[in-house]
């Protein structure tokens, strides 16, 4: 059951797992909801009937029953984990703490204009988890306007104290709000030779890379596979830091693959969702249930179910017996992971899917892409919304792109004539123009926010948010698409696809169907080339067919430019202009949503 | 066929910077990780510096870390690399090179001179 | 850091001779070795790799063997391409390090 509300003056009794400082009981069901083990605690706040070294205190519990006994106590706030509910989980904390000094290892301390200038040092410096951030009324002149960047083992402060005229607060790396590069590679036959913080085990290298990412403290691992030559190590993952923030060497190991922690990218990629199924593998760990299954996925699912359960073995029945089903071996740990991973026993094993909501809805995997053919069908572009006008007739006017579940991005040059937001539908989930219908139901738009340096396409900042009335529940045939991640500007995309219902040629009309095209990013240099009188600035990307022939058009603005990288969806354009539709040596110019996320961002998470 | 060219090279005073640039075809650039070895007139071969795939990890010889960095720019298939304060001892044909699973240098450029001289 | 060093520094040889170029390492390397050959004014080429394995496209003639210190480059019936430098690399870790080369001359 999902309890969401804080329990003021009430302490949850027994059950403590750990003890953690955090500067707010919000923080603490947080810390307690991403903790593999915890599902209540209990905050101590601030207030003269407390000792304050126990303020702040944050005391993570776990309860076989799910809950515990409640007692008053005066400034305690008590809860429950996020883990009991269905809604979607997010780790960026933007708070700024006031007259807080949050305690760790100071390890780097230089001059900023403003707490928010210390907060993105912080945000853009690998080993920073919080700061604190002495203002310019701070009593000592000489610390005055001083940024003390910090780290520990946990992510979370060692205590917390009063201090008046200091400011603190975390990183924002969870918000998506890095520039850290985000390095992607898998390096096969390597081990990275620095100090392990931890080691868990893992069934592969890419469970262990997401262990990395979500482990505070790991920058880069190294994964010993199964066919490892030191049995004692096979499938162990060891997560890693150095003081540099990079491998300081790399040694070459048949049997080993290394990595990087992709904190810097974590919004637009599975953590916490290990969805695979490990065949032939058996996952050890503290039993917690056995029940009959039909199917490893039926097992997945009781586990999913299950709060407590992390991960699970799947059995086969023996043939014609307990009418077919087998054996589902509910596990937990005290991290997460398996305390030892077995081959060759016959077992499926696999993870929980109840962690999926701590990563970005955007991650899920979407229906087989459909090969061949111009048209869509239903589900393949789930984030494709049309946007209609009503005045003075309803009709189709742009594409658009969910990235949230109250935000729709697509073209500023969409709203040129459009007093009011109040005119705009938002219809998703559509395939056929012909669905629409007076009674299909639509979202309506409750604010349009246009770059505010946006004059006309052809000259850049062509985009803007339209924010709706009512919130988008996610669907098979309705959800977002990921932003691309600021560390991956490198990354170059192979797999990119327009769709819109668009014309087909420059003198047509709205298509009924969503169409779909395939269409090669071209370089900036190589578009410039193809409009000479134009500006193609860093902020515009180009795609499109030398010889022409597949393109956006009329009526496809403001729609995305998918592409897929590593198995995920990421808007990397919006249709923005171009010169006639589909013409040779004319690619569409798109606008390069890469370099607007931080516009997006401090848009979507104000406040 | 995979193809990689060398351009940049030249004479340049001690103390200056000089830009090399390694232009590759017949293979997908931002599968590889690329390096860049150098070998003086007469002598033997060197590792210079190594580039993973994405750009994000870069690696250095010690004789000249904090004076040569080395970049990619996927998008164009090319691979580059910056060389300031330079010393006489930095002369050498530059090779750009693909680094391989087998940890070898699988391709090579033909090379582009640099003599650092006054 | 690993040094690596090439013996003999040149060797003189005949068409259809057997000839060995030895490369030791500064401390154990497993069989993490990469030889290569080079002609004047041309880019060196992989020849083997993980100190025995041939490189697609290399002829048969050449191979290696060694584990740990010491290395061996074999050339069965030397041809007259075959004259050239020959250079051993750690690929053990970084930094990568060559040996210094030997050269194969005609006798």
């Known amino acids: 059951e999902c309890v969401t509300q804080l329990l003021k003056d009430t302490c949850f009794e027994g059950g403590d797992i750990t003890t953690v400082f955090t500067p707010s009981a919000k923080y603490c069901q947080v810390v307690c909801t991403y903790h593999p083990r915890c599902l209540l605690f209990t905050f101590t706040a601030e207030s003269p009937s407390e000792d304050p070294t126990r303020w702040f205190t944050c005391v993570l519990k776990d309860s076989v029953t799910e809950t515990l006994p409640r007692v008053n106590r005066t400034a305690a706030i008590s809860g429950y984990s996020f883990k009991q509910c269905s809604h979607q989980i997010s780790a960026c904390n933007k708070d700024i703490y006031v007259d807080l000094d949050m305690k760790g290892i100071n390890y780097n301390s230089s001059v900023a204009k403003s707490a928010q200038e210390c907060q993105e040092r912080c945000t853009d410096d690998v080993h920073c988890h919080f700061f604190t951030y002495a203002t310019r009324q701070f009593p000592s002149l000489e610390h005055r306007n001083i940024c003390l960047l910090k780290h520990t083992q946990t992510g979370t402060p060692t205590r917390i104290t009063k201090l008046d005229k200091v400011v603190s607060g975390f990183s924002l790396k969870s918000c998506a709000l890095s520039n850290l590069a985000c390095i992607r590679d898998i390096f096969p036959n390597t081990v990275f030779a620095d100090s392990n913080i931890d080691s868990v085990m893992a069934p592969d290298a890419f469970v262990c890379g997401r262990i990395c990412t979500h482990h505070p403290g790991c920058l880069f691992f190294t994964f010993f596979s199964q066919e490892w030559p030191k049995e004692s190590q096979r499938n162990l993952c060891l997560l890693k830091t150095s003081e540099s923030g990079l491998p300081s060497t790399r040694i070459k190991k048949s049997k080993a693959l290394s990595g990087f922690s992709l904190q810097s990218c974590r919004h637009s990629i599975p953590v916490f969702c290990h969805s695979s199924f490990y065949h032939d593998t058996d996952f050890l760990g503290e039993e917690l249930d056995i029940v009959a299954a039909k199917s490893h996925e039926a097992c997945q699912k009781l586990c999913t179910n299950a709060v407590r359960c992390q991960f699970f073995t799947y059995t086969p029945a023996q043939a014609s017996c307990n009418e077919g089903k087998g054996k589902c071996y509910l596990k937990l740990s005290s991290n997460g992971s398996p305390t030892k991973i077995l081959h060759g026993r016959g077992g499926i094993s696999g993870y929980t899917l109840r962690l999926c909501k701590m990563d970005n809805e955007c991650t899920t995997k979407i229906k087989p892409r459909i090969v061949g053919g111009t048209a869509s069908v239903r589900g393949e572009w789930p984030w494709q919304v049309t946007l209609h006008t009503t005045s003075p007739t309803q009709r189709h006017l742009c594409g658009g792109s969910i990235i949230g579940n109250q935000w729709i991005l697509t073209a500023a040059h969409c709203f040129y004539g459009v007093e009011s937001p109040k005119i705009l539908r938002v219809y998703s989930g559509i395939l056929n123009q012909s669905e629409i219908k007076e009674d299909t139901s639509f979202f309506g738009v409750q604010e349009i926010i246009i770059h505010d340096q946006y004059k006309m396409a052809e000259s850049g900042y062509d985009i803007a948010l339209l924010k709706l009335e009512t919130t988008v529940n996610y669907t098979d045939s309705q959800r977002p698409i990921c932003l691309p991640s600021k560390g991956d500007r490198n990354v170059i995309y192979t797999d990119c696809w327009v769709t819109g219902w668009g014309y087909r040629k420059l003198r047509d009309k709205i298509q009924n169907t969503l169409q779909k095209a395939k269409i090669p990013l071209v370089t900036n240099e190589e578009c410039q080339k193809r409009y000479r009188g134009h500006k193609i600035t860093h902020k515009m990307i180009c795609a499109g067919y030398r010889e022409g022939g597949k393109d956006a058009c009329k009526g496809d603005s403001g729609g995305p430019l998918s592409c897929k990288h590593n198995e995920v969806w990421h808007l990397v354009g919006i249709t923005s202009w171009g010169e006639g539709c589909a013409q040779r040596e004319r690619p569409g110019v798109y606008t390069n949503v890469v370099e607007y996320v931080d516009w997006i961002l401090e848009k979507t998470q104000a406040v | 066929e995979v193809q990689l060219l060398e351009s940049g090279g030249g004479l340049v005073q001690p103390g200056g910077s000089l830009r090399l640039s390694c232009a590759a075809s017949g293979f997908t650039f931002s599968d590889y990780e690329m390096a860049w070895v150098r070998q003086a007139p007469g002598k033997g071969l060197e590792w210079v510096s190594s580039?993973?795939?994405?750009?994000?990890?870069?690696l250095y010889a010690d004789s000249v870390k904090g004076r040569f960095t080395i970049s990619r720019d996927n998008s164009k298939n090319t691979l580059y690399l910056q060389m300031n304060s330079l010393r006489a001892e930095d002369t050498a044909v530059y090779y750009c090179?693909?680094?391989?699973?087998?940890?070898?240098?699988?391709?090579w450029g033909q090379g582009t001179l640099v003599t650092v001289s006054s | 850091d690993i040094q690596m060093t090439q013996s003999p520094s040149s060797v003189s040889a005949s068409v259809g001779d057997r000839v060995t170029i030895t490369c030791r390492a500064s401390?154990?390397?497993?069989?993490?070795l990469a030889w290569y050959q080079q002609k004047p004014g041309k880019a060196p080429k992989l020849l083997i790799y993980d100190a025995s394995t041939l490189q697609s496209g290399v002829p048969s003639r050449f191979s290696g063997s060694g584990s740990g210190t010491d290395f061996t480059l074999t050339i069965n019936s030397l041809q007259p391409e075959d004259f050239a430098t020959y250079y051993c690399?750690?690929?053990?870790?970084?930094?990568?390090?060559f040996g210094q080369g030997t050269r194969l001359e005609i006798k």
């Open positions: 090179a693909t680094w391989g699973d087998s940890w070898g240098f699988d391709f």
């Open positions: 580039i993973v795939p994405s750009g994000g990890w870069t």
């Open positions: 690399q750690q690929a053990d870790s970084f930094p990568i390090a």
């Open positions: 401390q154990g390397i497993s069989s993490w």
